[in-house]
Amino acid sequence: DAHKSEVAHRFKDLGEENFKALVLIAFAQYLQQCPFEDHVKLVNEVTEFAKTCVADESAENCDKSLHTLFGDKLCTVATLRETYGEMADCCAKQEPERNECFLQHKDDNPNLPRLVRPEVDVMCTAFHDNEETFLKKYLYEIARRHPYFYAPELLFFAKRYKAAFTECCQAADKAACLLPKLDELRDEGKASSAKQRLKCASLQKFGERAFKAWAVARLSQRFPKAEFAEVSKLVTDLTKVHTECCHGDLLECADDRADLAKYICENQDSISSKLKECCEKPLLEKSHCIAEVENDEMPADLPSLAADFVESKDVCKNYAEAKDVFLGMFLYEYARRHPDYSVVLLLRLAKTYETTLEKCCAAADPHECYAKVFDEFKPLVEEPQNLIKQNCELFEQLGEYKFQNALLVRYTKKVPQVSTPTLVEVSRNLGKVGSKCCKHPEAKRMPCAEDYLSVVLNQLCVLHEKTPVSDRVTKCCTESLVNRRPCFSALEVDETYVPKEFNAETFTFHADICTLSEKERQIKKQTALVELVKHKPKATKEQLKAVMDDFAAFVEKCCKADDKETCFAEEGKKLVAASQAALGL
């Protein structure tokens, strides 16, 4: 599979349009502060160079690796040191160290302005005036804000973005047509970014073995009729795809993802009965569809797991011969029988099984030692089941906003050192588990909830890693990938925390809150709630609820007042005084 010119190979495989889009995404994910025009210029130069290599693969520099070509191009940016500081030092390194250096400087929370959506007519005019630039700008803005966004999937989002404008800009009511589509793309995009961020964290922080274990469990749930060898092949290929994308090798990643989709569709009879519709779609839709496909039905009459993994006299022999293969088979067999379990639970069970075999296969009577291993699984299964039952009960009682508030209080008490914006963002996302998962029947709740929580807690971990402030967060984030959620769940009040000084400015509100969207208004109130808990971590839930109810009434009252600003100033002082008295601040 060696090619004289890697850049020519990828250009030919992907086509010019996808090649340019992927190079733009790669550059924007590396140099997140660079202006759009600078990136377009760099992409055009790379594309022109690639074309010369397609024409003659022996032309000068065409034999260089993509990292060398792209890194050299990024290092031509004149303002590298003043814009990026120490990232400029990467350019003094040789490949592969230079690329590793760029990867380490990716910023999960770049200091970029919030994307403000222009008026629909303004957007439609821009779309019609220069469709290509309009779509490139979309790729650029998403990629620089989400430096680990799954690049081939971003191409799919861009395709849907284009389709939305194509359809809606000629509709009678442009806004009614376009805005819901853009909202959906935004929400799906954030979710997609967060899911991919967990895959990259899994690979980069816990290694290929951890990612492969995750993939075995998930693919076995999804394709329970597939043989273990088939699942293993898919896991190997999927691991390569995600390793490439997480490593910034976006051209290879997109190319390999297309190959994997092709393979799956050519072999769907031995993989899953649910793939037919997906495989009739064009490439980008096909890959997306396969990634989201529902679990196939479990084969009938699957034998008990105990026979091969507990009762057999060959357990230790089989384990010793090929440990990871045997554990992989255990995980495959357990996962295909349990679409009702979360992937992280399945991985905890496999880890427990591995630990037991490590201990027991060295014992005098191994069989006697591991005979009860499945009994150890019961508490591991019941823990997430109970937690989900309780939190869904609470969600149904409170509704999403107040459920988020309960989580805000819970997490602020656990890790009060974490910045208020991070606590608000993470707790709001944790709270969305209610509307996302609690509607499901029991059999679908756990995979929905716990695997979603893994994604959200990873957001907390990557944001915290940038500026670590809490040893407890670091501990839960780094000790075990699959035990992150139980680790955070088990945290109690941080008794070492010294309450924050009271600052009236934090609780001063102005008339501008009245013009905010409902979501933004909620965020303002939730920000105040976190600050309140940071000032008074011993406040009871009922005290906090009373203060929040008073606060909501205050905002509602002043937003109806004739002189809003005066109302906010005068009533605000009264509210702060009353809250201080109620909480003993």
Epitope: Q390, N391, E393, R410, S489, E492, K541, E542
Partner: nanobody, 124 residues
Framework: HVQLVESGGGLVQTGGSLRLACAAS????????MGWFRQAPGKEREFVAS????????YYADSVKGRFTISRDNGKDTVYLQMNRLIPEDTAVYYC?????????????????WGQGTQVTVSS
Amino acid sequence: HVQLVESGGGLVQTGGSLRLACAASGRAFSTYAMGWFRQAPGKEREFVASINRSGSSTYYADSVKGRFTISRDNGKDTVYLQMNRLIPEDTAVYYCAADSEGVGFRNMLEYDYWGQGTQVTVSS
């Protein structure tokens, strides 16, 4: 405020039984989840059992499952912990706690109101 008073502790032999009670006053008892926690000498306080506001859901620590039973009588504003087949490791001060959210989580941080505790000693 909710006031909680535990009773029923004492000295018992291994294999014996005790029934703890926790009487609540001050607020609508039936809106609170109730929990039992315990603290052995030199150890951290730990979850034992909890019950939601209606009494329809109960939760137990693995170490007491099958031996202890939590129940409540909303008419009497009281929660109970029936402890059977006691073992020396159950020796601790047992605390009753109330959670206004009414669900019955395992974490101490969810419980705003606590009793003073009652001593349970299991001798071998």
